[in-house]
Interface confidence: low
């Protein structure tokens, strides 16, 4: 019977202290005087001195009030010894349980909670959860059992009970239909947490509920009818800006407009885009409109949002009547670029070609022609007929004006509209080669020794094209063949000049006649410097002076 049942002590006791709790008693006290002591946290180890024992009587004493939230249970050991200090009992376990009092208020984990819910949701939709804690006991008592409630709602639109809070979990839910972001985008709820399961101390916090936008408003055209005027042929021309209003959140997918041309654009002439800031529909021409083909287009445009509608909404349609305005269109050369083959060197006044333009306009407008760019001044153009004639010598070999056998001319056509308009065409004359150039040797100056002379190789060039070029033939004239020989190589594109008799040091003219495959002959004088030397030389050596 050296046993003590668990001892319950309420926290926050009023005293007086020390307060007797229970008596330790060993039945060995019949035989000998017993001394009692206690050990453990709360007695002889921290927190020391909370409990003590009357040494001779065994009364267990409480020295000060207890705090359950600090220590809820003390585990001590009781000891019994005889006068000589010998232990007469095994150490006894003493359990002291601190019972709870409602000495703490609930505390919300935040002063302000934020949550969000989509507008238009059904009652029962969960919004957010708030949490409050209470340090008191919630297992054996209701002291720490928190009950949640909503104290107030701001604003009170459409009425003051839009939300409910679960009494025990703190989950805030929608309780009424009618959440409309366009009317109230945010609610402020004052929430309460009360301990004793709703009958005790209360604390408050704020829950801010943001109402998120849903696409519950269709964009509407304002106005719904438009008239626009567009000049024909204009591409990328802004025809009309269509304006819509949408009550959903600006710059959100539920507000941003998407436009669609539903009808009236048979030729795919129009396109419509959304202006990123104003949300307007910008109707522009994708292709040029043709007044002569169709002078009025009636378009039907529908508007929706980037985001789908969350409920069935009627879509808005706009009607745009586009009047095409007649424009004096420029004459167009047919074809825009004309290639004509013509022989070079044709006689002055000879016709080259006729190059004319057509006017898209329906009126019978008179077209006049003139040459806009004729770099060499070789051509003339009849202003009425568009007949192009040669007024200068067309020279295929003229490198200043002719590139790759082509001479490029720009011509202009002008109608008699008001104001007049002009169109340009390009005339590409492909000049056919005529054998009008003879072969020419290069170089035309040579230096040669009069003893053991080296053969001089001259390149032959001809500005004409094949077959008016190689193989070439060479012939020396005017007695040049007495001292010199001229031979064309096997390929027929170089001539080899050799000194065959001794000439004293001096400068001589060698008369060389070259003819091409078409027998076009060209006489060239080669200036030959003969030097007193042997073999190869580039310049004549000066006179030798003895010492």
């Amino acid at each position: 019977d050296w046993v003590v049942a668990p001892i319950s002590v309420p926290e926050n006791g009023k005293g007086p202290f020390p307060q007797r709790l229970n008596q330790l008693k060993s039945n060995k006290d019949r035989d000998t005087k017993i001394f009692y002591s206690i050990t453990g946290p709360g007695a002889d180890s921290p927190p020391e001195g909370v409990f003590a024992v009357e040494k001779e009587t065994g009364w267990l004493l409480l020295n000060k009030p207890l705090d359950r939230e600090e220590i809820a249970k003390y585990e001590l050991f009781g000891h019994a010894v005889s006068e000589n200090g010998a232990s007469v009992e095994d150490p006894m376990n003493i359990s002291i349980i601190v019972t709870d009092q409602n000495d703490h208020k609930p505390k919300f984990t935040q002063d302000t909670f934020r949550g969000s819910v989509l507008e238009g949701v059904l009652p029962g939709t969960s919004v957010m959860q708030v949490t409050a804690t209470d340090e008191d006991d919630a297992i054996y008592t209701y002291n720490g059992v928190v009950a949640y409630s909503i104290h107030s709602q701001e604003p009170k639109d459409p009425h003051d009970l839009m939300f409910t809070i679960h009494r025990s979990t703190g989950t805030i839910s929608v309780i009424s239909s009618g959440l409309d972001r366009e009317k109230v985008p945010e609610y402020t709820l004052t929430i309460q947490a009360t301990d004793m399961d709703g009958d005790g101390s209360t604390t408050t916090a704020v829950a801010v509920v943001e109402i998120l936008d849903a696409n519950d408003n269709a964009p509407m055209f304002d106005p719904q009818k438009y008239e626009a005027h567009v000049p024909e042929n204009a591409v990328g021309h802004e025809v009309q800006r269509l304006t819509v209003t949408d009550l959903d959140a600006p710059n959100s997918p539920a507000w941003r407009a998407t436009y669609l041309i539903m009808g009236g654009d048979d030729g795919d002439h129009f396109t419509i885009t959304t202006h990123p800031e104003s949300n307007q529909g910008i109707l522009t021409t994708r292709k040029g409109l043709d007044f002569e083909a169709k002078n009025q287009h009636t378009l039907y445009v529908e508007v929706t949002n980037e985001a789908p509608f969350v409920l069935k909404l009627p879509t808005s349609t706009a009607t745009i009547v586009v009047h095409v305005e007649d424009v004096n269109e420029a004459p167009v050369f047919v074809p825009p670029s004309k290639v004509v083959e013509v022989q070079e060197g044709i006689p002055t006044g000879e016709p080259v070609c006729v190059y004319t333009a057509e006017d898209p306009d329906k009126e019978n407008q008179k077209i006049s022609y003139r040459i806009l760019r004729d770099p060499a001044g070789w051509l003339a153009m009849d202003p009425d007929s568009g007949q192009v004639t040669a007024v200068g010598t067309l020279d295929r070999e003229d490198e200043q004006f002719v590139r790759n056998n082509i001479y490029e001319v720009m011509v202009l056509a002008m109608d008699n509209g008001s104001p007049p308009t002009t169109g340009t065409g390009t005339l590409l004359l492909t000049l056919i080669d005529v054998n009008d150039h003879g072969p020419v040797p290069e170089p035309r100056q040579i230096t040669i020794c009069n003893q053991s002379p080296v053969r001089q190789v001259l390149n032959i060039t001809d500005k004409d094209l094949s077959p008016h070029t190689s193989p070439f033939q060479a012939q020396l004239t005017d007695d040049s063949d007495i001292y010199w020989t001229a031979e064309v190589n096997e390929e027929g594109d170089t001539v080899v000049l050799s000194l065959k008799k001794f000439l004293k040091q001096d400068t001589y003219d060698v008369h060389l006649s070259l003819s091409d495959h078409g027998n076009k002959e060209q006489l060239t004088v080669i200036r030959a410097t003969v030097c007193d030397c042997h073999g190869h030389v580039e310049t004549c050596p000066g006179p030798w002076k003895g010492g």
Partner: antibody, heavy 123, light 113 residues
Framework: QVQLQESGPGLVKPSETLSLTCTVS????????INWIRQPPGKGLEWIGV???????NYNPSLKSRVTISVDTSKNQFSLKLSSVTAADTAVYYC?????????????????WGQGTLVTVSS | DIVMTQSPDSLAVSLGERATINCKSS????????????LAWYQQKPGQPPKLLIY???TRESGVPDRFSGSGSGTDFTLTISSLQAEDVAVYYC?????????FGQGTKLEIK
Amino acid sequence: QVQLQESGPGLVKPSETLSLTCTVSGGSITSYPINWIRQPPGKGLEWIGVIWTGGGTNYNPSLKSRVTISVDTSKNQFSLKLSSVTAADTAVYYCARSRGVYDFDGRGAMDYWGQGTLVTVSS
Amino acid sequence: DIVMTQSPDSLAVSLGERATINCKSSQSLLYSSNQKNYLAWYQQKPGQPPKLLIYWASTRESGVPDRFSGSGSGTDFTLTISSLQAEDVAVYYCQQYYSYPYTFGQGTKLEIK
């Protein structure tokens, strides 16, 4: 360019109702919330309340019993009414546009302000 | 209500030097769902309305010079002017929009030394 302009009487007698209007130009009047803020001479700023794009309102609890904010879309005007005024209500009153309608726009920050109008409460 | 406290009440800084204004809120302005701080900074010059400089604690409003920057999170925030210009002389206010009512700091007067 969005512009806001406050107007109303510069002098109001104690216990009477202060009435101001805010005219918005250069933008759709119903596209953004409009706030009212006041600033007593030489002092700091106090938020009075806001009217949302759909007409809902939220007021500062310290003024809630006396304040009404409303909108007249046909005139492009917002109005502020403050009843039972005292000398403590003497201030420059501003209307200011919220940055956006949506929370992610930074709705509570105010990007366009009127020049303000001084209202003196005195008998 | 959330109380906003600015420090210092007034500040004198030399031209070209850095100016720093602090703002403390009585509760956190950080919303965990979007990790944004619901705080704005305004500049008010004499006889003029306030001008929005910064929102979301650190996002510069368009047209505001890049010498203005905002930082901080939770309850402690800072407005910094990296190189003070003569035209920056004004009163600066912080404002919370985490919950209603919106509240402003008492203001910090910035002058040139």
